[in-house]
Amino acid sequence: LIIGFGISGRHSITVTTVASAGNIGEDGILSCTFEPDIKLSDIVIQWLKEGVLGLVHEFKEGKDELSEQDEMFRGRTAVFADQVIVGNASLRLKNVQLTDAGTYKCYIITSKGKGNANLEYKTGAFSMPEVNVDYNASSETLRCEAPRWFPQPTVVWASQVDQGANFSEVSNTSFELNSENVTMKVVSVLYNVTINNTYSCMIENDIAKATGDIKVTESEIKRRSHLQLLNSKAS
């Protein structure tokens, strides 16, 4: 969390951003909040990116003002116009690209004063893994698949029964480049699986950590997966 305060001139206002990550090829949100004003027409929001000449986005007098917008962001940004009045200056970014990574500044002017805060935005690819029993294999085998990751992640297997065990000798992980030549499909196979046990396939890079769990008993198979972004620090 980054909290910024205004400088000279008018009073300062508090602006808060949250470092976040964007999944390439999807919508991203750059989070920014500020002390609200009672009049929408008095609020100016400017988003800037380090190293980019034009603005990322500008919103003033209750509407978007894009005359100074940089070409690389044209048609790709929007604020949540109905939430600006309550202090939400977050930016929606369309079709996140690797090149969108960097340091952004959320700069706010209201009738109460000015303020700004920086935000570190990482970009990559991350997806939920799915763990299944591989019935084609000669022995009891689990297969963990996740369709899109970048940069290349690490994959670690764990088990509830054999806590702390190292499964690297009995697992095999491969990374297959997807058709767009950026992201990769992750496939990891775990051999010599015992029933009545819960196994976890953990995939992690510097942006996200995802886990796929599978519980195999004689009567049923239960699956669960979750994904967590690693760099959500507020400022």
Epitope: R76, A78, A81, N95, S179, E180, T183
Partner: antibody, heavy 121, light 107 residues
Amino acid sequence: EVQLVQSGAEVKKPGASVKVSCKASGYTFTSYWIGWVRQAPGQGLEWIGDIYPGGGYTNYNEKFKGRATLTADKSTSTAYLELSSLRSEDTAVYYCARLDGSSYRGAMDSWGQGTLVTVSS
Amino acid sequence: DIQMTQSPSSLSASVGDRVTITCKASQGFNKYVAWYQQKPGKAPKLLIHYTSTLQPGIPSRFSGSGSGRDYTLTISSLQPEDFATYYCLQYGNLLYAFGQGTKVEIK
């Protein structure tokens, strides 16, 4: 309610130009992109291009670059498509459509009723 | 430019059938695929955007899925009013592109 009302049918000779209008109401005209799509008789949909009336920014399908011109008049909340050097294969229904997502170029969510342009000698 | 290859170009089905239409992008990857329904003499109607988000007022029998280059529109139980032509749209890039269309006819 978002409404896009287009101008009436046109009959043009090969080599001529046509200008189709699209009057918007029910939303802030300058805050949303407007796209243009055409459909030849019995054929599929073909994207021509789009314009952001708030700044006049445009994107064009390569096929129509140099022949299609998109403009917008903020004072009347009207978008225009002008197509020059018409040929018989330009005979089609031309649609305008608002792009969802405000300044963000989204999918086309509201459509005009269409304008039939016939090119015939 | 990205091309969208839609299949099949036409299909015959009965009321109550499950219908699947696919679109394949020539390159790239993003979630910006929309699906439209068009009836003769009418403007297209947006059903689904961002791969799987249903437009307000569209029945839940319509669903969208996909990732990478492959996208699907599914009608879980075809109704009489669903006989129409369906188009996919790729809108993630600077240049938008429609699929060629799929005409759903009564068997």
